[in-house]
């Protein structure tokens, strides 16, 4: 997260760290007791490593009573996701067992009504992604509030030049932005999961390159079918 601040510890109990061989790779969001939603491209970076999910964490390194690392029983990328595009960039991870819920571990309600969030709405994005252009990684969860950007502006040639489909949404990126390592994390508007950080190799913090988020409401049928 660029231009953000440290999050209040455990105030986002839905927040997950998707890890490979014990290292943070991507963000994720607990959407059901045994399921974490993340970004499909995160799996590509995992190669043949062991994928696990950390729940109940604030610090990645320090011991915390609520922290627990779960093995992944099943990884289900969206069937239409492709390595060369950010389309359908969603991944569902089934935990090896149901998460132990509590004040620091709780699923987040996700948007089912397929309607665009009003431009200008302030939404919260959180993650353990890099906090500087130099690539510094934080130990503790960071967050930032970002205004939603209308799709027409996001589709301008100097922004994302028509690449933003109706299944995506954008948020402003003027110094405050999601960045490398935040992919798969949640964009939360009014206490509801609206978007998932896409995992393209986008420049961060440049206002002409807004953050791109996969709209979960657009994938309600797929999410329901996997969770069923």
């Amino acid at each position: 997260i660029l231009g953000g601040r440290e999050a209040e510890a455990h105030a986002r109990p839905y927040m997950a760290s998707v890890q490979v061989n014990g290292e943070h790779l991507c963000g994720g969001v607990l959407v059901a007791e045994q399921w974490v939603l993340s970004a499909a491209h995160c799996l590509e970076d995992a190669a043949d490593g062991k994928v696990q999910v950390l729940l109940g964490a604030h610090s990645l390194s320090q011991p915390e009573p609520s922290k627990r690392l779960y093995d992944v029983l099943r990884a289900v990328p969206h069937p239409d996701s492709r390595p060369d595009t950010i389309d359908h960039d969603l991944l569902l991870l089934q935990l090896s067992e149901k998460a132990t819920l509590g004040p620091a571990v709780r699923p987040l309600p996700w948007q089912r009504v397929d309607r665009d969030v009003e431009p200008g709405t302030l939404c919260d994005v959180a993650g353990w992604g890099i906090v500087s252009h130099a690539g510094r990684r934080p130990d503790r969860l960071q967050h930032v509030l970002l205004p939603v950007l209308d799709r027409a502006t996001c589709n301008r040639r100097t922004h994302h030049d028509g690449a933003i489909t109706q299944r995506m949404m954008c948020a402003e990126s003027n110094r405050r932005d999601s960045c490398k390592g935040d992919s798969g994390g949640p964009l939360v508007c009014g206490g509801v999961l609206e978007g998932v950080v896409t995992s393209g190799s986008r420049v961060c913090g440049n206002r002409k390159k807004p953050g791109i988020y996969t709209r979960v409401a657009s994938y309600a049928a797929w999410i329901d079918s996997v969770l069923a």
């Epitope: 209308d150 100097t158 390159k209």
Partner: antibody, heavy 116, light 112 residues
């Protein structure tokens, strides 16, 4: 299939105004800026301005400020350009184009002829 | 405004020949985001312009690979490796990095 359908040719008198339209088909109108260009006979293209179909906010080439006014009607997925105080210099083909990707989609053009 | 100067004004070619069109901008057209918004359009008689190349060298979908774009800073080139009859028309370069966006004066590709 993306299509931009422009209104038909206009013959107008000097000093009058004209409003030409550009109706969008095959995509969500509010997802892309609409741009307008002018091409006089045998000449190159000039950018007039653009409009955000969500907010109605328009940007103009300084050269066309006071001459062109851009508006949209979201309910009919239509962009409009009004040209006022017309002179023979304004006789041209006027194009609308969708921005994103680049100017990949253009209307067929509207010929405006200013003549007494 | 950024002036886009195209040369030549007219380019007579034989079918199957290579054609090369130059476009020079009066100032650098590298955008503040690092990208260069230089595009090429082909306008056939009585038609609207068609996008060929965007961001200097990227072919738009459906554009044959005989079209290629290159250049940087202020100097750009469009090459057509083997001219076909359907390629005839007026070619325009365009910069979208600075406001107002501007087009070149055009190069007419015609049969020798």
């Amino acid at each position: 299939e993306v299509q931009l359908q422009q209104s038909g040719p206009e013959l107008v008198k000097p000093g009058a105004s004209v409003k030409i339209s550009c109706k969008a088909f095959g995509y969500t109108f509010t997802d892309y800026y609409k741009n307008w260009m002018r091409q006089r006979h045998g000449e190159s293209l000039e950018w007039i301005g653009d409009i955000n179909p969500n907010s109605g906010d328009a940007n103009y080439n300084q050269k066309f400020k006071g001459k062109a006014t851009l508006t949209v009607d979201k309910s009919s997925s239509t962009a409009y350009m009004e040209l006022r105080s017309l002179t023979s210099e304004d006789s041209a083909v006027y194009y609308c184009a969708r921005e994103g990707p680049s100017f990949a989609y253009w209307g067929h053009g509207t010929l405006v002829t200013v003549s007494a | 405004d950024v002036l886009m100067t195209q040369t030549p004004l007219s380019l007579p070619v034989s079918l199957g020949d290579q054609a090369s069109i130059s476009c020079r901008s009066s100032q650098t057209i590298v955008h503040s985001n690092g990208d260069t918004y230089l595009e090429w359009y082909l306008q056939k008689p009585g038609q609207s312009p068609n996008l060929l190349i965007y961001k200097v060298s990227n072919r738009f979908s459906g554009v044959p690979d005989r079209f290629s774009g290159s250049g940087s800073g202020t100097d750009f080139t469009l090459k057509i490796s083997r001219v076909e009859a359907e390629d005839l028309g007026i070619y325009y370069c365009f910069q979208g990095s600075h406001v107002p966006p501007t087009f070149g004066g055009g190069t007419k590709l015609e049969i020798k």
